[in-house]
């Protein structure tokens, strides 16, 4: 026997208390599929969340984050504070990347510079807090007697102390 509720379209609910008639979802609620016995409560984008898409009778609201924050989690379930490039977010706020690490984004953690020597290459451009090192050709790529450019010696940034 067919369930009478299966005829209720998205945007309605099948009323348990009224002989299973299809009724529209009330304000601030929705049903995204047909045959639902209850309507879901609309998400509210409050505080640091911003409304990206309004709730309708058939779909939930979608949120993003106010400027200075970025989304985390499925469906932007959290907003996390942005930091500057060259920093990472800690419990105490934004902190500069430690020497030997970098972050080229406003989010995420500082990652170690690439170790060029592991691939048998040399450092072409030194790393900074904001940028990874750039590896160049390996020193053995230069045949004796061939003019070559001297590679910069790997070294730290002046004044940037390890912490």
């Amino acid at each position: 026997l067919q369930d009478p509720c299966s005829n209720c379209p998205a945007g309605t609910f099948c009323d348990n208390n009224r002989n299973q008639i299809c009724s529209p979802c009330p304000p601030n609620s929705f049903s995204s599929a047909g045959g639902q016995r209850t309507c879901d409560i609309c998400r509210q984008c409050k505080g640091v969340f911003r409304t990206r898409k309004e709730c309708s009778s058939t779909s939930n609201a979608e949120c993003d984050c106010t400027p200075g924050f970025h989304c985390l989690g499925a469906g932007c379930s959290m907003c996390e504070q942005d930091c500057k490039q060259g920093q990472e977010l800690t419990k105490k706020g934004c902190k500069d990347c430690c020497f030997g690490t970098f972050n080229d984004q406003k989010r995420g953690i500082c990652r170690p510079w690439t170790n060029c020597s592991l691939d048998g290459k040399s450092v072409l451009v030194n790393g900074t807090k904001e940028r990874d090192v750039v590896c160049g050709p390996s020193p053995t790529d230069f045949s004796p007697g061939t003019p070559s450019t001297t590679m910069p010696v790997p070294g730290g940034e002046p004044g940037h102390t390890s912490h």
Partner: antibody, heavy 122, light 112 residues
């Protein structure tokens, strides 16, 4: 139509605990269900609700501390992720009857289970 | 989040008398009417008395009457019986995906 909670016991702080709410005479897909607790000497405190389709909504203080999930058409769970002594209480599960036909949770919580006691102590 | 403030506890009256418990909300409940009243006795689960501000729940005597709208609600118990000694709670429904429901602090009714 009835509701019954189980799983309450003595746990040490930080030990996750899952409570179960078993319903009979109706399906969880047809109603909103709520979890409410009462600490010793305190009033009733709303924890959260789950819709018929399985969407969950929590009190702001309960977010991250509790997880409501449906394991079958007749069993609902409440997980206390990292209990503290403040979570010592009787935990109740109740159906939202929606007798006025709104189509969502209205606060007409009925029936209720007898409750299950959770004691958090070191 | 909204706050529901109930009449200071306890409220006492004699058998056969009338008590009135108020529930004041800091914000209007959904539809100005989604407020329920519960009776709670020690060792027992809460019992639904009134839903949608004034609708009497099934099996509840008509001595219990709910009224009010928006932010101000009242539960009146007339012809008081000794069995009515309990703590009474109001709960409001709010248009929010967090703190969807808020309970009042409770009002103890003492029957003399």
């Amino acid at each position: 139509q009835s509701v019954e909670e189980s799983g309450g016991r003595l746990v040490t702080p930080g030990t996750p605990l899952t409570l179960t709410c078993t319903v009979s005479g109706f399906s969880l897909s047809d109603y909103y269900m709520t979890w409410v607790r009462q600490a010793p000497g305190k009033g009733l405190e709303y924890i959260g609700i789950m819709s018929g389709s399985g969407s969950t909504y929590y009190a702001s203080w309960a977010k991250g501390r509790f997880t409501i999930s449906k394991t079958s058409s007749t069993t609902l769970e409440l997980k206390i992720t990292s209990p503290t002594t403040e979570d010592t209480a009787i935990y109740f599960c109740a159906r939202d009857g929606d007798y006025a036909g709104w189509g969502y949770a209205t606060g007409a919580f009925d029936p209720w289970g007898p409750g299950t006691l959770v004691t958090v102590s070191s | 989040a909204a706050v529901l403030t109930q009449t200071p506890s306890p409220v006492s009256a004699a058998v056969g008398g009338t008590v009135t418990i108020s529930c004041q909300a800091s914000q209007s409940v959904v539809g100005n009417s989604l407020l329920s009243w519960f009776q709670k006795k020690p060792g027992q689960p809460p019992k639904l008395l009134i839903y949608s501000a004034s609708s009497l729940a099934s099996g509840v005597p008509s001595r219990f009457k709910g009224s009010g709208s928006g932010t101000q609600f009242t539960l009146t118990i007339s012809d008081l019986e000794s069995d009515d000694a309990a703590t009474y709670y109001c709960t409001g429904r709010y248009n929010s995906d967090t703190d969807t429901f808020v309970f009042g602090g409770g009002t103890e009714v003492v029957v003399k």
